[in-house]
């Protein structure tokens, strides 16, 4: 029997394969057969593709015909067109190549016709009855990438045997499509099986690097082992991994079990699964899923605070009723005046100091001081009355430096020392009022909106910190923050701002400006149009003073009565942000065309300004950020925690705004 007729064979390039199946089939049967294997009948549209078909078919007998993917319905002649009215089975008539056996004749085309390729000579195209069972058919398979054929090694017992995803087995391949398997038999007896897989860095490649057939010892190339090579009694080698790593499926490389571990916070190698998950202080493992961590409500513990307690995610705060001040222990309350202002300000520094260098702190504040840019012609909003109390905000991080954010004045002044709220770069915390203590610079006037520091050290994909959501169970519902979830791309490339999309995380290619999608909030007629932000700009966050319902997950709208907009005028494309509230039409902000996304300078001078990711790096190499609210999906989420507006607030000229007190508070984040 001639090899032409024996077995199917294929010829593959880097992005597609042609396969010849010498099986007698009608056109429809052939089409189905290709489709069942994940391909289509061959569509050689270019001279290059035709050349690959020619080399695959070879010099077959003239009597043999092979279906290709061209068909024409009855009375559909278009003789002047290259395909003569025929259509590729992919549904189009595009082609840069034809190989008709005869010039077009002016017949009436009364019947459906299909095209077969001659196996001999120049592999001309012939038309004929689609129901005729010709000698075979040509399939075409497209794919995302291909692996090159393996190089023969000295220790191999024979050529590698490849199996493609369309079930073709052969040793004769130059390229192997994604999903192919290579079986290599070694002279020493053992063989290797490799898979053509997607590589983490992009593209495709073999699941294992050579050498596949190793010598009898560890001496050449460490026996192919990534970590440790052990020579067995029979002369073969086996690989071992150093502590904290486990042997990968290929038996050669080592993998960090925590790299892919689904731990929400901290991961430790070891245990039955190769890793175990742990939660930071202030959190405990979720009962339904030990990979997740849930907040411990310390306020449920009797006597945790002398007077009042507010639990938040990862911590809690004690505060005191009117006329009392929190003592240095952070728990007890004493009558007002019994403790000086300085003592109140320093309570976290003395009681809960985590060892941060004070000079570094001051440097960070100096870097922030003066980082204001004048913003002419913008209507700012201010609270109904100035605050009459002091607040110590203590953002808590497991980092050496804490980026701070200027906090707005409140819309409501509760007669309490308000709780401290943890801050993360992914969280715009505009929920509570603050007053700057004497040791820190005061804020500029109402016409000088701040620039938010947002340039952070680069984090690996595995160590990105998603959002922590503060909750306030003890506060009246009117004062609880609304929630807006905004997807956060996993890691923006260098020189690119964080990518924010309300619906599509990780859609922005490298060096391309992120776009805020149009958002509409039902009932409020709030429309936010934000332009693409150039790579040297960070995204603008616009704070609107409309009374919005809290159930607006897709809207990029920050709700507060007294929030400053961090904006710098530039020559960038215009930004239009409008908000119409059915309740208070006076709460409209019109941002002029000159008003543009802010460049966000860093408060972390020692960190690289090129990566704008979350500012938190875990202390443990395998620790992961808490993900609250937890959502399934490929990337961490950015949640904006926003206050409910005060029912009676009205816009007036903005007064002095306050910065958070600068001190470390909560060792629960360590």
């Amino acid at each position: 029997q001639d090899p032409w007729a024996a077995e199917p064979r294929a010829a593959c390039g880097p992005s597609s394969c042609y396969a010849l199946f010498p099986r007698r089939r009608t056109f429809l049967e052939a089409w189905r057969a290709c489709r069942e294997l994940g391909g289509d009948l061959a569509t050689p549209r270019t001279p290059e593709e035709a050349q690959r078909v020619d080399s695959l078919v070879g010099a077959g007998p003239a009597s043999r015909l092979l279906w290709i993917g061209l068909q024409r319905q009855a009375r559909q002649c278009q003789l002047q067109r290259p395909l003569r009215g025929f259509t590729w089975t992919t549904g189009d008539q595009d082609t840069a190549f034809t190989n008709w056996a005869q010039p077009a004749s002016g017949g009436p085309c009364p019947a459906q016709r299909c095209v077969a390729l001659e196996a001999s000579g120049e592999h001309r195209w012939l038309e004929g009855s689609c129901t005729l069972a010709v000698d075979g058919y040509l399939c075409q398979f497209g794919f995302e990438g291909a692996c090159p054929a393996l190089q023969d090694e000295a220790g191999q017992a024979g050529p590698a045997v490849y199996t493609t995803p369309f079930h073709l087995v052969s040793t004769e391949f130059e390229w192997l499509p994604f999903g192919s398997v290579a079986a290599v038999q070694c002279q020493a007896g053992r063989g290797a099986s490799l898979l053509c897989v997607k590589q983490p860095e992009g593209g495709v490649g073999w699941s294992r690097a050579g050498p596949l057939c190793l010598g009898t010892g560890c001496s050449p190339d460490n026996g192919g082992c990534e970590h440790e090579c052990v020579e067995e009694v029979d002369g073969h080698v086996s690989c071992r991994c150093t502590e904290g790593f486990r042997l990968a499926a290929d038996g050669r490389s080592c993998e960090d079990p925590c790299a892919q571990a689904p731990c929400e916070q901290q991961c430790e190698p070891g245990g039955p699964q190769g890793y175990s998950c742990h939660c930071r202080l202030g959190f405990r493992p979720a009962e339904d899923d030990p990979h997740r961590c849930v907040d411990t409500d310390e306020c449920q513990i009797a006597g945790v605070c002398q007077q009042m307690c507010v639990n938040y995610v990862g911590g809690f705060e004690c505060y005191c009723s009117e006329g009392h001040e929190l003592e240095a222990d952070g728990i007890s309350c004493s009558p007002a005046g019994a403790m000086g202002a300085q003592a109140s300000q320093d309570l976290g520094d003395e009681l809960l100091d985590d060892g941060e260098d004070e000079e570094d702190e001051d440097e960070a504040w100096k870097a922030f001081n003066g980082g204001w840019t004048e913003m002419p012609g913008i209507l700012w909003m201010e609270p109904t009355q100035p605050p009459d109390f002091a607040l110590a905000y203590r953002p808590s991080f497991p980092e050496d430096r804490e980026p701070q954010i200027p906090y707005p004045e409140p819309t409501w002044p509760p007669p309490l020392s308000a709780p401290r709220v943890p801050y993360h770069s992914s969280v715009l915390s505009v929920t509570r009022p603050v007053v700057v203590s004497a040791t820190h610079p005061t804020l500029p006037s109402a016409h000088q909106p701040p620039v938010i520091p947002a340039t952070h050290p680069a984090l690996s994909r595995d160590h990105q910190i998603p959002v922590i959501a503060a909750n306030y169970p003890d506060l009246p519902s009117a004062y609880q923050p609304g929630i807006l979830s905004v997807s956060h791309s996993a890691q923006p490339p260098a020189h690119q701002p964080p990518m924010i999309s309300t619906k599509y995380p990780e859609l922005f290619p490298a060096h391309q400006s992120p776009m805020f999608p149009d958002t509409r909030v039902a009932g409020t007629q709030t429309t936010t149009h934000l332009p693409g932000i150039p790579p040297n700009h960070a995204p603008l966050v616009t704070t609107l003073g409309a009374q919005l319902p809290p159930q607006a997950p897709d809207a990029l709208v920050l709700r507060t009565q007294a929030t400053q907009l961090p904006i710098i005028p530039t020559a960038q494309p215009s930004l239009t942000t409008t908000s119409r509230s059915p309740v208070s039409p006076a709460h409209q902000i019109s941002v002029p065309a000159a008003t543009q996304p802010a460049a966000l300078p860093t408060l972390l001078p020692s960190q690289s300004p090129t990566n704008q990711t979350s500012p938190i790096s875990p202390t443990h190499p395998h620790s992961k950020a808490p993900q609250i609210p937890r959502e399934d999906g490929p990337s961490p989420k950015l949640a904006l925690w926003l206050p409910s507006p005060a029912p009676t607030a009205a816009p007036t000229a903005l007064g002095e705004a306050g910065l958070a007190e600068h001190s470390q508070r909560d060792d629960r984040w360590l």
Partner: antibody, heavy 124, light 108 residues
Framework: QVQLVQSGPEVKKPGASVKLSCKAS????????IHWVKQAPGQRLEWMGY????????TYNQKFKGQVTITVDTSASTAYMELNSLRSEDTAVYYC?????????????????WGQGTLVTVSS | DIQLTQSPSFLSASVGDRVTITCRAS??????VAWYQQKPGKAPKLLIY???NRYTGVPSRFSGSGSGTEFTLTISSMQPEDLATYFC??????????FGQGTKLEIK
């Protein structure tokens, strides 16, 4: 020009065998499939089987399988059909025919050239 | 197997007459149908292939039409040399050819 010349008539007794020949000329022998067709008196034509001289690929009609063997000698550009265990109902004219590959840009499996036929008579 | 039925089995026509022979298939055969002419004591000759394509050298008075299960051979103007038996053949399930029983055309 294309020609298929068949061997002369045969008279055989029941149970005997006969081998018919079909010599091709005027074309490349290995480029075309050769079929054998039976025409019994008063009956319609019946396809018996084919051979592809390129690779000796053969296929038989189930009705004749076991009784018929088709072979080729490419060096002589000749196809053969052997009939075994002859019976009286095997009395017929046997034709060899060439299957066409393409005509004017059309592929088709009709039989474009036929031999003159060989009469086989089976009689005791 | 696919059965082919020709009608009529016998046909008398005068020179110059338009003659039509039909062939019905027991199932869809697309256009994989051929028509042959066999004169007494001779081998069949191909007239029409692929249901409607006239073979090289065949006079233009012969034409074929149809697809699926109904096929027609038409002689537009009967000539004395057209006296013969005409067969239809299907090959859609190639190589399993089947033939019609034949139509014998006589001259009146």
């Amino acid at each position: 020009q294309v020609q298929l010349v068949q061997s002369g008539p045969e008279v055989k007794k029941p149970g005997a065998s006969v081998k018919l020949s079909c010599k091709a000329s005027g074309y490349t022998f290995t480029d075309y499939v050769i079929h054998w067709v039976k025409q019994a008196p008063g009956q319609r034509l019946e396809w018996m089987g084919y051979i592809n001289p390129y690779d000796d690929d053969t296929t038989y009609n189930q009705k004749f399988k076991g009784q018929v063997t088709i072979t080729v000698d490419t060096s002589a550009s000749t196809a053969y059909m052997e009939l075994n265990s002859l019976r009286s109902e095997d009395t017929a004219v046997y034709y060899c025919a060439r299957r066409g590959n393409s005509y004017d840009g059309y592929f088709d499996y009709s039989m474009d050239y036929w031999g003159q036929g060989t009469l086989v008579t089976v009689s005791s | 197997d696919i059965q082919l039925t020709q009608s009529p089995s016998f046909l008398s026509a005068s020179v110059g007459d338009r003659v039509t022979i039909t062939c019905r298939a027991s199932q869809n055969v697309g256009t994989a149908v051929a028509w042959y002419q066999q004169k007494p004591g001779k081998a069949p000759k191909l007239l029409i292939y692929s249901a409607s394509n006239r073979y090289t050298g065949v006079p233009s008075r012969f034409s074929g039409s149809g697809s699926g299960t109904e096929f027609t051979l038409t002689i537009s103007s009967m000539q004395p040399e057209d006296l013969a038996t005409y067969f239809c053949q299907q090959y859609t399930n190639y190589p399993m050819y089947t033939f019609g029983q034949g139509t014998k055309l006589e001259i009146k």
